[in-house]
């Protein structure tokens, strides 16, 4: 008789999840010499231990503590790039500007990027059928708690000038409910962060508006200023040219505004 299984509203665990995490870990540690000491089997065991046999609506940051410890990685604190709703461009940027880091350029972020996972209470099974949706089911699910945990710690590590890439095509360029707006902004440490610099990425070819004057950007500026961190904002009118100029800064067309 098939056992009754809880049906959640979100997609189930990504197929071949254990193999994917292990393979990503091996690949990352091969490419990054400073992480060669990492035992990927232990990393997988710690990852698994965070959610297997636990109710997928009852996950805590402490569940991920062993994984966080194993994935400890010193990121240059003044080279951190945060992003909100514009992941692909942020990643294209750090692939070119190799000395800057998004969360997904770290081992822990790389392991989990674009994956979904959850288990079931009191069984060692991974649930490939469905996982809790943050809105429809519960917020303390394995995926949401993981990203909240690593995002908080990533923001805590930042110092000096922190950059954030924001999507100027969205109705809310700064969204208080995004991971950036609800977690990272509030965990920048004023004792060591001097400035948050927002890069607002324009979508339209002929969009010459100053999106730094957008009401949601003003809201971000207000939140940041109240935390005793300075705020600055730049429009990136042509993201394609922006990337090209990061690749070839000596190009004569790169002296004009991008």
């Amino acid at each position: 008789v098939p056992r009754w299984r809880q049906q959640w509203s979100g997609p189930g665990t990504t197929k071949r999840f254990p193999e994917t995490v292990l393979a990503r870990c091996v690949k990352y540690t091969e490419i990054h010499p400073e992480m060669r000491h990492v035992d990927c089997q232990s990393v997988w065991d710690a990852f698994k231990g965070a959610f297997i046999s636990k109710h997928p609506c009852n996950i805590t940051e402490e569940d991920y503590q062993p994984l966080m410890k194993l994935g400890t990685q010193t990121v240059p604190c003044n080279k951190i790039l945060l992003w909100s709703r514009i992941k692909d461009l942020a990643h294209q940027f750090t692939q070119v500007q190799r000395d800057m880091f998004t969360l997904e350029d770290t081992l822990l972020g790389y392991l989990a990027d674009d994956l979904t996972w959850c288990g079931e209470f009191n069984t060692s099974k991974i649930n490939y059928q469905s996982c809790p949706d943050w809105r429809k089911d519960c917020s303390n699910n394995p995926v949401s708690v993981f990203w909240k945990t690593v995002s908080r710690r990533f923001a805590e590590a930042a110092c000096d000038v922190v950059h954030v890439m924001l999507n100027g095509s969205r109705s809310k360029i700064f969204d208080k409910n995004s991971t950036f707006g609800s977690v990272e902004v509030h965990n920048l440490q004023p004792e060591k962060v001097q400035t948050l610099e927002a890069w607002v990425i324009h979508g339209g070819r002929e969009d010459s508006r100053d999106l730094c004057q957008d009401p949601t950007i003003k809201e971000l500026e207000s939140i940041i200023s109240k935390r005793n961190i300075q705020f600055s904002c730049k429009n990136i009118y042509r993201p394609d040219k922006f990337l090209q100029c990061v690749k070839n800064p000596e190009d004569s067309s790169c002296t004009s505004e991008i």
């Epitope: 402490e62 410890k69 994935g71 990685q73 010193t74 690593v150 710690r153 990533f154 590590a157 440490q189």
Partner: nanobody, 119 residues
């Protein structure tokens, strides 16, 4: 210069108490509160083992062998973590090491302090 310095070790009799302190200094600890602080120990001829830890949110965990006898705490204003050790036993004899860990800042160790429990 990053420095974790343990103090408070010594020779005591079984049943007595000791309080270990771990003081963190250096620019990396400018925001000490975000670090998870832990105490490890290494007994003669044994592997290093976790004794107790306290997260940035002040959640504590203990090794089974010390539960109810040891208490970990922290004073973020003083950049210091403590290990209160009561009802000490001969098997608690070890070098005790302080560890400060933050996922994206680093993993730092002290030099250790000797604790000897003997009658």
């Amino acid at each position: 210069q990053v420095k974790l310095e343990e103090s408070g070790g010594g020779l005591v009799q079984p049943g007595e108490s000791l309080r270990l302190s771990c003081s963190a200094s250096g620019s990396i600890f400018k925001v000490f509160r975000v670090f998870a602080m832990s105490w490890y120990r290494q007994g003669p001829g044994k592997q290093r083992e976790l004794v107790a830890s306290i997260s940035s949110g002040e959640t504590t965990t203990y090794a089974e062998s010390v539960k109810g006898r040891f208490t970990i705490s922290r004073d973020n204003a003083k950049n210091t973590a403590y290990l209160q050790m009561d009802s000490l036993k001969p098997e608690d004899t070890a070098v005790y090491y302080c560890n400060a860990d933050h996922t994206f800042t680093g993993d730092f160790w002290g030099q250790g302090t000797q604790v000897t429990v003997s009658s």
